[in-house]
């Protein structure tokens, strides 16, 4: 997992905010390959670079999440953007739709850790993120970064500083921070995964 | 079908190394973590610890941390269990193990190996 | 670590009858908690997770119950391939753990 999402990521970034915002209104559009649904419209309007990149991948997975998104690009007349891409892109194998729903012994989103997954939502909804950070300094977080969250202002910006470190973060690290939100806000984990 | 056949039983010495293999099929090696799970003569299980192959990060119960390396080799499918010095007390049965799924992290081992049985005697 | 606590140690039942074998947290461990069926030579067995979920291919005499820190796994009728040792699992912190099982044996 990785390579792919960050050539989106990548490709988002170096849009400007107006084709951003043409990006996401032709997203809303696109033909989409049978079984897979819309990312739906009120969500993604608000969406910046990385929410837009973790949301792609969560619906349609990295390989067909990439494919999309050079679709729109080339759509857009951006082919030099939409090339680099795909030529960035490992050819991966494909997926059930994220409009099917799969039993949850089946993984639906196998290597997608549940942290990304979800990113959108714990960012919106964690609360308690001084304790999420007291449990992972010295394991996952330095103290640079353990300070750069603290600093900001609201849980919602807290969160989204913290998921700025997430990119270089492993499995267990990942799941170090799903063990500290199980024990701070396991209601929210339980939420979640029904979800 | 998810398998996982483990090595053969080994007879060891204390200060001998040893490394024995779990080598899996019938789903992409990379999208699960692989567990080790160890059983002493006659006694109860005990987690040991985990590699995800995707990218090879593991976790280890601080009980075996500095004991063990657990590895894995995607190109061949197989994770590893590691001694660089048996001791006497190493003699047990080793299973490797797979969850149920492993996206939320909730490790319920739905599939298991054979167990490999390791002996350190002098 | 989380302590799992399992109860009774030996159970001796005859086939036919009802089991019941407990498991306690040291804390809360929510729903995450497994159970496991091992035979003498043979690698546990899946058969319950998340508290009171019945794994596939796993006969309905079985269920699991509980939630915090009090768990139960039952056997409605026992038969006669039901004797084995039972283990708990928690699975919401590491390190994963395992209670010291049960022994269901014939009476």
């Known amino acids: 997992m990785g390579r792919a999402r960050d050539a989106i990521l990548d490709a988002l970034e170096n849009l400007t905010a107006e084709e951003l915002k043409k990006f996401k209104l032709k997203l809303l559009s696109v033909p989409l390959r049978e079984g897979y649904g819309r990312i739906p419209r009120g969500a993604l309007l608000s969406m910046d670079a990385l929410d837009l990149t973790d949301k792609l991948v969560s619906f349609y997975l990295e390989t067909y999440g990439a494919e999309l998104t050079a679709n729109v690009l080339r759509d857009m007349g951006l082919q030099e953007m939409a090339g680099q891409l795909q030529a960035a892109t490992h050819q991966g194998s494909g997926a059930a739709p994220a409009g099917i729903q799969a039993p949850p012994q089946s993984a639906a989103k196998p290597g997608l850790h549940f942290i990304d997954q979800h990113r959108a939502a714990l960012i919106a909804r964690v609360t308690n993120v001084e304790w999420l950070l007291d449990a992972l300094y010295g394991k996952v977080l330095t103290d640079e970064q353990y300070q750069a969250v603290r600093a900001e202002p609201t849980n919602p910006s807290k969160m989204r500083k913290l998921f700025s470190f997430t990119p270089a973060w492993n499995w267990t690290c990942k799941d170090l921070l799903l063990q500290a939100l199980r024990e701070s806000q396991s209601y929210l984990v339980e939420d979640l995964e029904r979800s | 079908e998810v398998q996982l056949v483990q090595s053969g039983a080994e007879v060891k010495k204390p200060g001998e190394s040893l490394k024995i293999s779990c080598k899996i099929s019938?789903?992409?090696?990379?999208?699960?973590?692989i567990h080790w799970v160890h059983q002493m003569p006659g006694k109860g299980l005990e987690w040991m610890g985990y590699?995800?192959?995707?990218?090879?990060?593991?976790m280890y119960n601080e009980k075996f941390q500095g004991q063990v390396t657990i590895s894995a080799d995607k190109s061949i499918s197989t994770a590893y269990l590691q001694w660089s010095s048996l001791k006497a007390s190493d003699t047990a049965m080793y299973y490797c193990?797979?969850?149920?799924?492993?996206?939320?992290?909730?490790?319920?081992?739905?599939?298991w190996g054979q167990g490999t049985l390791v002996t350190v005697s002098s | 670590e989380i302590v799992l606590t399992q109860s009774p140690a030996t159970l001796s039942l005859s086939p036919g009858e009802r089991a019941t074998l407990s498991c306690h947290a040291s804390?809360?461990?929510?729903?995450?908690l497994s159970w496991y069926q091992q035979k003498p030579g043979q690698a546990p067995r899946l058969l319950i997770y998340?508290?009171?979920n019945l794994h596939t291919g796993i006969p309905a005499r079985f269920s699991g119950s509980g939630s915090g820190t009090d768990f139960t796994l039952t056997i409605s009728s026992l038969e006669p391939e039901d004797f084995a040792v039972y283990y708990c699992?928690?699975?919401?912190?590491?390190?994963?753990?395992f209670g010291q099982g049960t022994k269901l044996e014939i009476k």
């Open positions: 193990a797979r969850p149920l799924y492993s996206y939320a992290s909730y490790y319920w081992f739905a599939y």
């Open positions: 019938g789903y992409s090696f990379t999208d699960q973590t």
């Open positions: 590699i995800y192959p995707g990218d090879s990060s593991a």
């Open positions: 804390q809360n461990i929510n729903v995450y």
């Open positions: 998340k508290s009171s």
């Open positions: 699992q928690q699975g919401q912190s590491y390190p994963l753990t």
